[in-house]
Interface confidence: medium
Amino acid sequence: ADPGQDRTDLLNVCMDAKHHKTKPGPEDKLHDQCSPWKKNACCTASTSQELHKDTSRLYNFNWDHCGKMEPACKRHFIQDTCLYECSPNLGPWIQQVNQSWRKERFLDVPLCKEDCQRWWEDCHTSHTCKSNWHRGWDWTSGVNKCPAGALCRTFESYFPTPAALCEGLWSHSYKVSNYSRGSGRCIQMWFDSAQGNPNEEVARFYAAAMHVNAGEMLHHHHHH
């Protein structure tokens, strides 16, 4: 499934999903970790506020399904959710899906390798019970719980490498890029908005590459 295959508009776009705005624009009051996107965002202030909560109403997803997730780890999941909900720069990786709760998803977003490495390092002592968080949960209580027989173990047990975490967690929403932060060739989950949003340049690069190659990806394979 080649990213971007279903869309002609690849730049400055919002995904057609559960909480996204239909059109990106300024959002002065974006909360805490989502604030880097306030100049141009696909999320509303209330979405940004809600996603910082444990078991937020957005998806009823409980990060603490195997005991308290370490704060150093949780901040990466919050940042990941901010990127997912707020970024208008992921158009080249939008793909249509047939799901009850959204019409589009991201696939193979090239995450800067340091962002993935740091996420894994900060989380490998926290606990979980699954290696793919999109499917297989027990939702009978309305909140995700570990399914029968799924044991709580350290992240490192379920995600033995940085790639296993970043690529496997959300069914290949991300792929680990060979490129580094600041290269203009990979998406940064973390950035300082004082310098602008570095992901705009990245989206432009890949959108241009896709047009030159008649919609085919330049980079090799493989999200939310």
Epitope: K113, S131, E156, S157, P160, T161, E167, N178, H220, H222
Partner: antibody
Framework: EVQLVQSGAEVKKPGASVKVSCKAS????????MHWVRQAPGQRLEWMGW????????KYSQKFQGRVTITRDTSASTAYMELSSLRSEDTAVYYC???????????WGQGTLVTVSS | SSELTQDPAVSVALGQTVRITCQGD??????ANWYQQKPGQAPVLVIY???NRPSGIPDRFSGSSSGNTASLTITGAQAADEADYYC???????????FGGGTKLTVLG
């Protein structure tokens, strides 16, 4: 371009050991796991084990536990698989494969034929 | 059990649709991956995760799953698709991987 290049074919006597290498290029070696899979002539693929190229942690299939050792040299971006106490039924093509999440092997080496014969 | 079961052989007429299945308990909580292997060659990943195709894999290949069964569907089979197809899956307990026994696909005509 991602490439996994394996060492050449080997002929070994029963009871001996063999060490197969797999040199990776075109990506950051330490971010991925490397797995080893073998295939005896006309048989199915058989998973042997893996190594976290970043920290050296290994996990082996129960079937090969005690006979297989997987190591890596990060400075050379190379993974190794050593199999000891060889027997004739270990005659197979041995593959290294890069793991993108868990069990999704997107790149494979060309394979190394190990023949065990007296 | 950590077994994955595949039909040993399946045939399809040229241009028709064929479905290859893979069954096992591990597939209730893990996606299957699918590989194509031609004689004398290393396996090639054709479907991974939910239903993702590596670049270069034709869109006639697709994957799906339900319960403990994963399926690989080839819509409009070509002569070049004649090969062995293997599924694999992560086994959550112990971070192991298991392969299915393989399905030999013959394209007729």
């Amino acid at each position: 371009e991602v490439q996994l290049v394996q060492s050449g074919a080997e002929v070994k006597k029963p009871g001996a050991s063999v060490k197969v290498s797999c040199k990776a290029s075109g990506y950051t070696f330490t971010i991925y796991a490397m797995h080893w899979v073998r295939q005896a002539p006309g048989q199915r693929l058989e998973w042997m084990g893996w190594i976290n190229a970043g920290n050296g942690f290994t996990k082996y299939s129960q079937k090969f536990q005690g006979r297989v050792t997987i190591t890596r040299d990060t400075s050379a971006s190379t993974a190794y698989m050593e199999l000891s106490s060889l027997r004739s039924e270990d005659t197979a093509v041995y593959y290294c494969a890069r793991d993108i999440s868990y069990g999704s092997f997107d790149y494979w080496g060309q394979g190394t034929l190990v023949t065990v014969s007296s | 059990s950590s077994e994955l079961t595949q039909d040993p052989a399946v045939s399809v007429a040229l241009g028709q649709t064929v479905r290859i299945t893979c069954q096992g308990d591990s597939l209730r909580s893990n996606y299957a991956n699918w590989y194509q292997q031609k004689p004398g060659q290393a396996p090639v990943l054709v479907i991974y995760g939910q239903n993702n195709r590596p670049s270069g894999i034709p869109d006639r290949f697709s994957g799906s799953s339900s319960g403990n069964t994963a399926s690989l569907t080839i819509t409009g089979a070509q002569a070049a698709d004649e090969a062995d197809y293997y599924c694999d899956s992560r086994v959550s307990t112990g971070n192991h991987v298991v392969f299915g026994g393989g399905t030999k696909l013959t394209v007729l005509g």
